[in-house]
């Protein structure tokens, strides 16, 4: 999906209002210095591309993020503010259904969510730079 035509201001507002709080809740008990951020993003479409991939693509070390509250809200936000996004997400929905039902938060999932927080923060910063 090409995120170029999204309403970035509306996505920022949704992130600051709800998604960020859910991510921080997920990370509760860990320090920001516990994990080294190894990925970043260049501009707003790039940030959303990587956020979407990291949130919804199960990885061998962390298969369950797609079922978390922040992931559901991310999906709703992208569907709302990115034209045509919903139609591209049939595969992602299947991935969510296949994701483990276990609610165990592994260290690797915490690390992945730490990376996500970094990508979202970069998204906000690139937005501020453009204004």
């Amino acid at each position: 999906y090409d995120f170029t035509n999204c309403d970035f201001q509306k996505i920022e507002a949704d992130y600051l209002r709800t998604i960020s709080k859910d991510l921080i809740t997920y990370m509760s008990g860990t320090k920001s210095t516990d994990f080294n951020n190894t990925v970043s993003c260049s501009n707003r479409p790039h940030c959303l591309t990587e956020i979407q991939s990291l949130t919804f693509n199960p990885t061998p070390r962390c298969a369950s993020l797609a079922k978390e509250m922040f992931a559901r809200k991310t999906k709703a936000t992208l569907a709302l503010w990115c034209p045509g996004y919903s139609e591209t997400q049939i595969n992602a929905t299947q991935a969510m259904k296949k994701a483990r039902k276990s609610k165990v938060t592994t260290n690797k999932c915490l690390e992945q969510v730490s990376q996500l927080l970094g990508l979202w923060r970069r998204f906000i910063r690139t937005l501020l730079k453009k204004q």
Partner: antibody, heavy 117, light 108 residues
Framework: QVQLQESGPGLVKPSETLSLTCAVS?????????WSWIRQPPGKGLEWIGY???????SYNPSLKSRVTISRDTSKNQFSLKLSSVTAADTAVYYC??????????WGQGTLVTVSS | EIVLTQSPATLSLSPGERATLSCRAS??????LAWYQQKPGQAPRLLIY???SRATGIPARFSGSGSGTDFTLTISSLEPEDFAVYYC??????????FGQGTKVEIK
């Protein structure tokens, strides 16, 4: 200390597919970062080809997108480049590199691929 | 596509002298710029990222400055091992990351 090592044929015929592999040691490619390919024609500058991230997202240089495929094999801790329909203009030293999806902090030593019949 | 123009193409200096290399972008890249050093037969090495942050293990004599469209790499006092080709790279314009054409720093 991460180390990267390119391998593959040094000579490819025009119109065929160039295939290279980058073996990574000292770091798991499924643990973090992105894993990128960059090339440098003899005596010329650098051109970014694309990357695959540790979680599987892939991004390509638009000028090469129609001909490029980057994939990975996490069990062997390596990633690969395929470039189809090559011409003499694809003759270059091909580097693999670790990236944070922005810039490139560790590089392989490079492998020269010549396109010639 | 953002075009990066490096100048001069060649810089002839003696060890101990100060080197000032320029990289100009065809449009603003904010501070999304990196510098690399490449010696003959070797891979490039990251020197500077985010326009002014030194990469791990890079000596303090290397410094980067600039924002927007004009950037400078300064080598405060050239060591014999610093004679090489230097490239700038912008990462503001995903998915079209581009490099400059390079500046060769040679011994006078």
């Amino acid at each position: 200390q991460v180390q990267l090592q390119e391998s593959g044929p040094g000579l490819v015929k025009p119109s065929e597919t160039l295939s290279l592999t980058c073996a990574v040691s000292g770091y798991s490619i499924s643990s973090g970062y992105g894993w990128s390919w960059i090339r440098q024609p003899p005596g010329k500058g650098l051109e970014w080809i694309g990357y695959i991230s540790y979680y599987g997202s892939i991004s390509y240089n638009p000028s090469l997108k129609s001909r490029v495929t980057i994939s990975r094999d996490t069990s062997k801790n390596q990633f690969s480049l395929k470039l189809s329909s090559v011409t003499a203009a694809d003759t270059a030293v091909y580097y693999c590199a670790r990236t944070n999806l922005l810039y490139f902090d560790s590089w392989g030593q490079g492998t020269l691929v010549t396109v010639s019949s | 596509e953002i075009v990066l123009t490096q100048s001069p193409a060649t810089l002839s200096l003696s060890p101990g002298e100060r080197a000032t290399l320029s990289c100009r972008a065809s449009q603003s890249v904010s501070n999304n710029l990196a510098w690399y050093q490449q010696k003959p037969g070797q891979a490039p090495r990251l020197l500077i990222y985010d326009a002014s942050s030194r990469a791990t293990g890079i000596p303090a004599r290397f410094s980067g400055s600039g924002s927007g469209t004009d950037f400078t790499l300064t080598i405060s006092s050239l060591e014999p091992e610093d004679f090489a080709v230097y490239y700038c790279q912008q990462y503001s314009d995903w998915p079209q990351y581009t490099f400059g054409q390079g500046t060769k720093v040679e011994i006078k």
